[in-house]
């Protein structure tokens, strides 16, 4: 037999909260347990589901869980079935609702002195108790002509008067909880003696010297009073008007007329209505003076044919908001088509060259009109007037490459040389018409040039080559004065270039032929062994067929190169003593001697009393000081060559003699003079 150990029992439950109906079964064999609700099987959901043999509720729901639950246990083998006792929920709930008008049937029927009943549509179980509020203040029974019962959901106002006007709300509470009205009710019962607005004044915008009218009307029983005030609370009446409102007229119907409005009339006007009872009603309206500012300038615009472009017109600041329109050639643009106005924008679709011209944006309001022009250029791809031509330019002269094009707007021309952009400098100049000038053509200017002419619509380019026609010139020009060392081998080079490879030959300036030991080998004059007679003037002649000949004159001097007879030596001198640095050189022409001390040339005219350079070239320094220490260089030079040799000078302190030493005692160390020296020649 199937036995219920635990049976479900009826119980209180809270709406939306958890609950559990228990059921436990004992049987000899396996049994299948399921639940019935009002006789129908219960299907598991997320909210309500079997938990073992019991039935669990995640959130009790009044509509779905009202009824009788029963636990059924069935032995599927024997077919035996047992049913538990019935169980149900006493569901406690509360649900908000609106405050509604119960009597009279519609708001339109509410009149002073009629009975008004409001109903609070908050329901619940157990039945809640109700509390009413007007404008948030609780109402208690028996006060101010109204009836309210906490158990009753109705509020009765008998009779209803203006004092009952306000926002009515209700709240209810029970064992389950509390709820307040989801929608409140505004009761409005007019007091005929209160001023009521019939016509309210509106803000107005007027142009200077125009007129402005404010309308204002109130109604009440008995009729209300009406008063106009301006800004600073100055009353406006037909009898007493402030000076700045002397053109104001108040009409019997309450309207206020201002004529020939000035800036000082702008401001806030207040219309005040006062009934026999109730508060004054204050209505405000503002008088604005119309104004319009200037429009910003447009930048000229460049568009390309076939594109779609827009030009936005920023309307000027103004009151009232200025209206904006576009015109072209004196005709207002339509709102559709190929060239049209859209909002404040000028739209040009599929631009044609004929669309170029001046377009005008107009803006206007009561204060006046403003306009601004925009110049629209329709760009065209450049076309050639004159392409750059392959050119042969002469070295040393200015060269020109044309790049003449035409387009709208005026095209910009840039030049490239060896694929590199040419930036204008002292050698290159690009004229306004696009022509490139090479100020002084050089051999390496012979290369490829490319010019590119561009507008926003596109660009064209062309290339040209430059062949430089070389000057006939010496490369490098021979030195006009040159020296050769007597009794030695010598060479004097001369080379030249031209459009054709030049022939080079040497001549003696006096026309005499070169001696047999002097040879002229492709421009190099070679002296096997220089003699005194080889000195003199020589001419190098370079010539070719197309360019003729050029000459360079060279004066050759035969010299005995410089040698030093005496060289300065490493010298150490006591401070305060005299140092002698000897230097003697020989050569032809006779060399001159110069001294350099501490990296600066010692100028004989500015040596001062302590230093002197002798005729033979020796340098003497009297009363030497430590700062005289350093390297001294003897430089021997003549018109043919220069040679130098150097030696260091050391200045040391003189030792102080000890008492035991007599006046004739030898110094504690010897003065060392080494004979190392270095010499160089140029």
């Amino acid at each position: 037999a199937i036995v219920f150990i635990k049976q479900p029992s009826s119980q209180d439950a809270l709406q939306g909260r958890r609950a559990l109906l228990r059921c436990e079964v004992e049987a000899p064999g396996p049994v299948h347990v399921y639940w019935l609700l009002d006789g129908a099987p219960v299907q598991d959901t997320e909210r309500r589901f079997a938990q073992g043999s019991s039935l669990s509720f995640a959130a009790v729901d009044r509509p779905q869980d009202s009824g009788t639950f029963q636990c059924v246990a069935r032995d599927d083998v024997t077919g035996e079935e047992a049913r538990s006792a019935n169980a149900s929920f006493n569901i406690k709930w509360i649900e908000a609702g609106p405050v509604v008008l119960k009597h009279p049937a519609s708001e339109a029927e509410i009149q002073p002195q009629t009975q008004v009943t409001l109903r609070c549509h908050i329901d619940g179980h157990p039945r809640p108790t109700y509390q009413w509020f007007r404008d948030g203040t609780p109402l208690s029974d028996g006060q101010s002509n109204h009836t309210v019962s906490s158990k009753e959901r109705n509020l009765t106002l008998r009779p209803a008067g203006p004092e009952h006007s306000g926002l009515y709300s209700c709240c209810a509470h029970s064992a389950f909880g509390q709820a307040c009205s989801s929608q409140n009710f505004t009761l409005s019962i007019a007091d005929e003696s209160f001023a009521r607005v019939v016509l309210a004044p509106q803000d107005v915008v007027v142009a200077r010297y125009e007129e402005a009218m404010f309308h204002c009307q109130f109604s009440a029983q008995p009729p209300p009073s009406l008063q106009w005030l301006f800004e600073d609370e100055t009353p406006i009446t037909n009898r007493s008007r402030p000076p700045h409102l002397r053109r104001a007229t108040v009409f019997a119907n309450g309207s206020l007329l201002l004529t020939q409005v000035r800036p000082r009339n702008a401001g806030i006007y207040r219309c005040i209505g006062q009934g026999q009872r109730g508060p004054p009603i204050i209505l405000e309206a503002t008088l604005h003076l119309a104004e319009i500012e200037d429009m910003p300038l447009f930048e000229p615009r460049v568009f390309t044919a076939g594109s779609e472009e827009r030009v936005t017109c920023l309307p000027p600041k103004g009151l009232p908001e200025p209206s904006v329109w576009w015109e072209h050639a004196g005709v207002r643009l339509p709102t559709h088509g190929r060239v049209y106005q859209k909002g404040h924008e000028l739209v040009l679709a599929n631009i044609a060259e004929s669309d170029a011209g001046v377009y005008t944006c107009h803006a206007a309001n009561l204060a006046g009109q403003r306009r601004q022009d925009v110049n629209i250029t329709v760009a065209t791809v450049p076309s050639w007037l004159k392409k750059p031509q392959d050119s042969q330019l002469e070295e040393g002269k200015p060269g020109y490459l044309d790049c003449l094009t035409q387009a709208t707007p005026k095209p910009t021309v840039v030049w490239y040389r060896n694929q590199m952009l040419i930036s204008e400098d002292s050698r290159f100049e690009v004229f306004k018409n696009g022509t490139l000038r090479i100020n002084s053509v050089e051999v390496y200017d012979g290369t490829w040039y490319r010019c590119m002419s561009s507008t926003p619509a596109g660009s064209i380019e062309a290339q040209a080559r430059v062949q430089v026609l070389e000057k006939l010139k010496f490369t490098p020009p021979p030195q006009p004065q040159q020296c050769m060392e007597f009794d030695k081998e010598a060479t004097v080079p001369c080379s030249a270039t031209g459009r054709e490879k030049p022939t080079i030959k040497w001549e003696r300036a006096d026309g005499s032929s070169l001696p047999e030991w002097v040879t002229d080998n492709a421009g190099t004059l070679h002296f096997a062994r220089v003699t005194r007679d080889d000195a003199g003037n020589y001419t190098c002649i370079a010539s070719n067929g197309p360019q003729g000949q050029i000459r360079a004159h060279v004066q050759l001097t035969v010299a005995v190169f410089i040698t030093f007879k005496v060289e300065p030596e490493r010298t150490t001198v006591y401070q305060g003593h005299t140092a002698l640095l000897q230097c003697e050189a020989q050569g032809d022409p006779k060399p001159l001697i110069q001294w350099k001390g501490k990296d600066r040339i010692l100028d004989p005219t500015k040596l001062g009393p302590r230093m002197h350079i002798f005729q033979n070239g020796s340098l003497v320094i009297h009363d030497v000081a430590p700062e005289d220490s350093g390297r001294y260089t003897c430089i021997a030079g003549n018109s043919c060559n220069i040679k130098h040799t150097e030696a260091p000078l050391y200045v040391v302190d003189k030792p102080v003699p000890e008492e035991s030493e007599g006046p004739g005692s030898p110094p504690p160390y010897k003065m060392i003079q080494t004979h190392h020296h270095h010499h160089h020649h140029h």
Partner: antibody, heavy 120, light 107 residues
């Protein structure tokens, strides 16, 4: 007498590199523009590029610009073509040419060419 | 890049006949067209340089004409030694571009 003698050709694998030389004589090499032209077997001529006397201007045909480098050594009177990333379509006879004038553009001296074969 | 279209690709002519080869460019190159002759196993030889200029030593039976985009190379009386490939070369702009060549044979 102007002479241009190309060398350095031969068999090279795809993706490999090769440096061609052109020894010039009989003219002042340091004063002239030079160029390279190639000819695939049984096909037409293709200009590779040219180079000015001091190497400050080098021009290439765009399709070869990233593969080939033209250079020169005026002291050695030699023009070079450095080939890299070679493919089978680079198989050709490579000519070195002397441009005696830029205006008119006169490629009137050509070497006998050196053959390059690209094959794996 | 200027492309050069050369026609015909091959030509078979009798000795003494007039030979005409045409090159058309896709851009205006003024008169910067050159004409080369290449005999089997030899490098190309410049016959006519820019501006329809006949090179020194080239026989006067060779000539050229044209300006802009259309160019014609003519051999007035063909000789057997004229059997060769002929190429046009535009030198107006970089890169320089050759025509595809015309093979001239004896009929």
């Amino acid at each position: 007498e102007v002479k241009l003698l190309e060398s350095g050709g031969g068999l090279v694998q795809p993706g490999g590199s090769l440096k061609l030389s052109c020894a010039a004589s009989g003219f002042d090499f340091s004063r002239y523009w030079m160029s390279w032209v190639r000819q695939a077997p049984g096909k037409g001529l293709e200009w590779i590029g040219d180079l000015n006397p001091d190497s400050s201007a080098i021009n290439y045909t765009p399709s070869l610009k990233d593969k080939f480098i033209i250079s020169r050594d005026n002291a050695k009177n030699t023009l070079y073509l450095q080939m890299s990333k070679v493919r089978s379509e680079d198989t050709a006879l490579y000519y070195c040419t002397l441009i005696t004038t830029l205006v008119p553009y006169t490629m009137d001296f050509w070497g006998q060419g050196t053959s390059v074969t690209v094959s794996s | 890049e200027t492309t050069v279209t050369q026609s015909p690709a091959s030509l078979s002519m009798a000795i003494g006949e007039k030979v005409t080869i045409r090159c058309i460019t896709n851009t205006d190159i003024d008169d910067d067209m050159n004409w080369y002759q290449q005999k089997p196993g030899e490098p190309p030889k410049l016959l006519i340089s820019e501006g329809n200029g006949l090179r020194p030593g080239v026989p006067s039976r060779f000539s050229s004409s044209g300006y802009g985009t259309d160019f014609v190379f003519t051999i007035e009386n063909m000789l057997s030694e004229d059997v060769a490939d002929y190429y046009c070369l535009q030198s107006d702009n970089l890169p320089l571009t050759f025509g595809s060549g015309t093979k001239l044979e004896i009929k």
